[in-house]
Interface confidence: low
């Protein structure tokens, strides 16, 4: 049945009308408007942009648009006492200092309030000592250093290259290794694609470019001072010593020109293998300390940033549903940027703006969606997903009862090669069906569907003829909705060719060079990829809000549950002797997955056959679909991570950006051979299998016939 039957509207107000209203030229215009000055969270400029968006969304025709403010912990450099790193000689004289700012891009020389590169939430301090190069500072890199190479990082300043994992995990790993400071740098191997010029002549990172970013380990807590509750006017705030997720050692980021000066003098151990070498003309020696001639020189960090409780502002727009106003489909993306935000976030915010305008146009012509659509412009995402998390904490009771889906809308592009989608398995079929109806913007795929170009360029590793869809991890504003509240979530953007471009993220990520011109000149001059992303995000929202039966297929969850159960069983089977000794069995989990598969199959059959003209039965079936994601939530959360409550998916404990399946079992098994008390460790594995099996079985039962 077509979507428009729900609200008795004229046939022209269907998905096609919504999609046809989306215009690349408007997205381009909005991007320009949003990127002319910095919009750092907590600043007046970002408050003014919030008010502008509020005003424009009202003009576009939304029913209401409100600002929701919170007072959260943010972090800023000291304007009169800049952060930097020195090489000091034996007399303590500074013989080299890193740069205090990035050279501004052409045309932006006179822009004020460009925050210099810093690691948000770094404590103050001036540690000095020998340097140890720790590669990407991943868990496995520290294993290599400590276990294989017998190098002790205790009391050392470590230097790590950006990439592969979230920077907060790097800092946590360094802390656990005993380091007293961390220097983060962008290596050309990861942030300089071969054959491309540096900005402003291309999209590569120049030597003076630096990646900003927060270094928190919040594990979904939101504002560090008010975990679990909104940072409102009457909030009780923790003391800074009890704040969640703050680093305990000074951290600072630098570019590769400055990194060269630090790394070229490194002595000590040679790199263990080629995977530890980047592209600078340095030996990539691990250290500790400098080589012969320079062995008396040390590195000193000077960090003076401050943590401050600051007001932030979300913009929340509402388009009331005509039939089920108490069912919410949410489209949200952040507004705050580190500097100009040319890609992150404004390429996403511009797309949201155009989606709102298109929905508003339809509404002005008399149309309404079946369900309520909420639009959000989040603040302080860059400081730890704070705006979205505080709003969700404030509205958690409404969201857990009424939330149908959340679609994220950060950066629309990180490349211009093909589509990239991460979502709940419930949305696989929605994404497949939608992309089959959209035109591919890719060269060589004229007249072909987006599904076809996406599948060709990014094939599924498991299913031939289908595109890759990844697990949701974190590092963006869907986190609280999916990982904490269990609301079906998804995200889509255009991405690079991961096969040929092995650098991490895009080269100019979080640098001053992420400008409007970067996008307009190098990534998407015609804004055709932005338009495609608008069609995907907007099309998903349209279908989720307007289809009579929710476009969720529970059978796809059954398929992945089997895959994840096999995967975690295989990991456990690396320890066959211990599994025997401690009587570890996965039978309960496989049995629960089998039951889920059978019940999901029967539910899907009933979904085809029931009387859709009966509003009570329709609502009942839709509620079973809506609440399925919720059924995977464990109210007790994961061990030591109470705000990660989804039993099937959580951000990896080793990389916040990546999703891990059956994370409770995975973490219990991780490095289990090194645990001092194997009996206790394997007992925890068994407990986690029990929790997972129970949760899958309980979720299955929500799909059974109700009586």
């Amino acid at each position: 049945k077509s979507s428009n039957e729900a609200t008795n509207i004229t046939p022209k107000h269907n998905m096609k009308a919504f999609l046809d209203e989306l215009k690349a030229e408007n997205i381009k215009k909005f991007l320009y408007n949003f990127t002319q000055i910095p919009h750092l969270a907590g600043t007046e400029q970002n408050f003014q942009l919030a008010k502008q968006i509020q005003s424009q969304w009202k003009e576009f025709g939304l029913d209401s648009v409100e600002l929701a403010h919170y007072d959260v912990l943010l972090s800023y450099p000291n304007k009169t006492h800049p952060n930097y790193i020195s090489i000091i000689n034996e007399d303590g004289n500074e013989i080299f200092n890193t740069s205090l700012f990035e050279p501004p891009p052409p045309g932006y020389e006179n822009v004020s309030d460009i925050v210099p590169p810093f690691s948000a939430f770094s404590p103050q301090g001036m540690p000095e000592g020998d340097l140890v190069y720790v590669n990407y500072a991943r868990t496995e890199d520290f294993f290599k250093l400590e276990r294989d190479m017998k190098i002790n990082c205790s009391g050392k300043i470590v230097i790590a290259r950006y990439g592969k994992v979230f920077r907060g995990n790097k800092v946590k790993n360094a802390q656990l290794a005993g380091a007293k400071g961390v220097i983060l740098y962008s290596d050309p191997a990861d942030y300089f694609a071969p054959g491309v010029k540096s900005y402003p002549d291309g999209w590569n990172l120049p030597g003076g470019g630096v990646q900003r970013g927060n270094i928190l380990n919040l594990n979904g807590a939101g504002d560090p001072l008010t975990p679990g509750y909104p940072a409102n006017e009457y909030a009780y705030r923790r003391g800074i010593a009890e704040a969640v997720g703050l680093p305990s050692i000074p951290v600072h980021p630098i570019g590769y020109y400055d990194a060269q000066k630090l790394l070229e003098k490194m002595g000590g151990s040679a790199p263990p293998d080629s995977s530890w070498r980047g592209s600078l003309k340095v030996p990539y020696n691990v250290g500790p300390g400098f080589t012969g001639n320079f062995s008396t020189q040390k590195v000193k960090m000077h960090i003076h940033s401050t943590n401050e409780v600051t007001r932030i502002y979300n913009v929340i727009g509402t388009l009331r549903g005509a039939v089920e106003p108490d069912r919410y489909v949410i489209l949200g993306g952040h507004r705050d940027s580190w500097v100009f935000g040319g890609i992150d976030p404004q390429s996403g915010a511009a797309v949201v703006h155009e989606i709102v305008r298109s929905f508003g146009t339809l509404k002005k012509e008399g149309w309404r969606p079946r369900r309520t659509i909420l639009f959000a412009s989040w603040d302080a995402e860059e400081f730890g997903l704070l705006g979205s998390t505080e709003w969700a904490e404030e509205n958690s009771r409404l969201l857990q009862e009424r939330g149908v889906a959340y679609i994220n809308a950060d950066s629309s592009i990180e490349g211009n090669y093909t589509l990239r989608v991460d979502c709940t398995p419930l949305m696989y079929s929605l994404v497949h069906n939608l992309t089959k109806e959209l035109k591919s913007p890719d060269e060589g795929f004229e007249g072909k569907s987006l599904y076809e170009s996406w599948t060709k360029k990014s094939p599924s590793p498991e299913f031939s003829g289908m595109p890759r869809i990844s697990k949701l991890g974190s590092g963006n504003d869907f986190e609280v909705f999916f990982q904490r509240l269990g609301i079906a979530s998804g995200r889509a953007r255009y991405t690079k060719n991961w096969e040929t471009n092995k650098f991490s993220g895009y080269p100019l990520y979080h640098s001053v060079y992420e400008t409007y011109e970067l996008v307009e000149k190098f990534y998407d001059p015609m804004f055709k990829y932005h338009l495609t992303v608008a069609q995907v995000r907007g099309g998903m929202v349209f279908e989720l809000a307007n289809s009579i039966v929710l476009p969720f297929d529970c059978r796809d969850y059954a398929v992945v549950l089997r895959k994840y159960a096999d995967k975690i069983y295989s990991i456990s089977m690396k320890h066959p002797q211990e599994m025997k000794t401690y009587s570890v069995s996965f039978d309960s989990l496989f049995s629960a997955v089998k039951n889920f598969t059978e019940i999901a199959s029967k539910f899907s059959e009933r979904l085809q056959d029931f009387d859709k003209s009966n509003p009570i039965v329709l609502r009942m079936m839709n509620d079973q679909l809506m609440f399925l994601e919720r059924a995977f939530i464990d109210p007790l959360g994961l061990p030591d991570r109470p705000f990660y409550r989804h039993v099937i998916y959580a951000p990896s404990s080793h990389n916040k950006y990546a999703g891990e399946s059956f994370p409770g079992i995975y973490d219990a098994l991780f490095d289990i051979e090194s645990k001092v008390d194997p009996s206790k460790a394997w007992g925890e594995v068994k407990r986690q299998i029990y929790v997972a099996a129970f949760t899958v079985q309980a979720a299955a039962e929500t799909l059974s016939e109700v009586a």
Epitope: P461, E462, F463, K563, K567, S570, I571, M573, K574
Partner: nanobody, 124 residues
Framework: EVQLLESGGGVVQPGRSLRLSCAAS????????MHWVRQAPGKEREWVAV????????YYADSVKGRFTISRDNSKNTLYLQMNSLRAEDTAVYYC?????????????????RGQGTLVTVSS
């Protein structure tokens, strides 16, 4: 106990073919990806090919692409490697190896067990 037993090696002339087999026992063969790896005298071990648990996905090293074919028979718990157009540089001990996972993508390959190997010598 996991056991992998390779067979089918021998001396063969360049341009000719050979078919290696690997009989697996001690684990649920149909639930795991399987690999062939090889080691030439005095050289590092080289990954050759992987086949997913159900045979639906196969990946090959560039050096053997188009000449070698990996296959499996889950009913017989056996892995195969059909080697055509053999070259002198294919001379090596060939090992079959069990993946720790489903073996569905070359980026996620880690073998936890491998066999004793079978020697293939390509010489005129």
């Amino acid at each position: 106990e996991v056991q992998l037993l390779e067979s089918g090696g021998g001396v063969v002339q360049p341009g000719r073919s050979l078919r290696l087999s690997c009989a697996a026992s001690g684990f649920s063969f149909s639930g795991y990806g399987m690999h062939w790896v090889r080691q030439a005298p005095g050289k590092e071990r080289e990954w050759v090919a992987v086949i997913s648990y159900d045979g639906s996905n196969k990946y090959y090293a560039d050096s053997v692409k188009g000449r070698f074919t990996i296959s499996r028979d889950n009913s017989k718990n056996t892995l195969y490697l059909q080697m055509n157009s053999l070259r002198a540089e294919d001379t090596a001990v060939y090992y079959c190896a069990k993946d720790a996972n489903w073996g569905q993508h070359p980026d996620h390959t880690s073998f936890d067990y491998r066999g004793q190997g079978t020697l293939v010598t390509v010489s005129s």
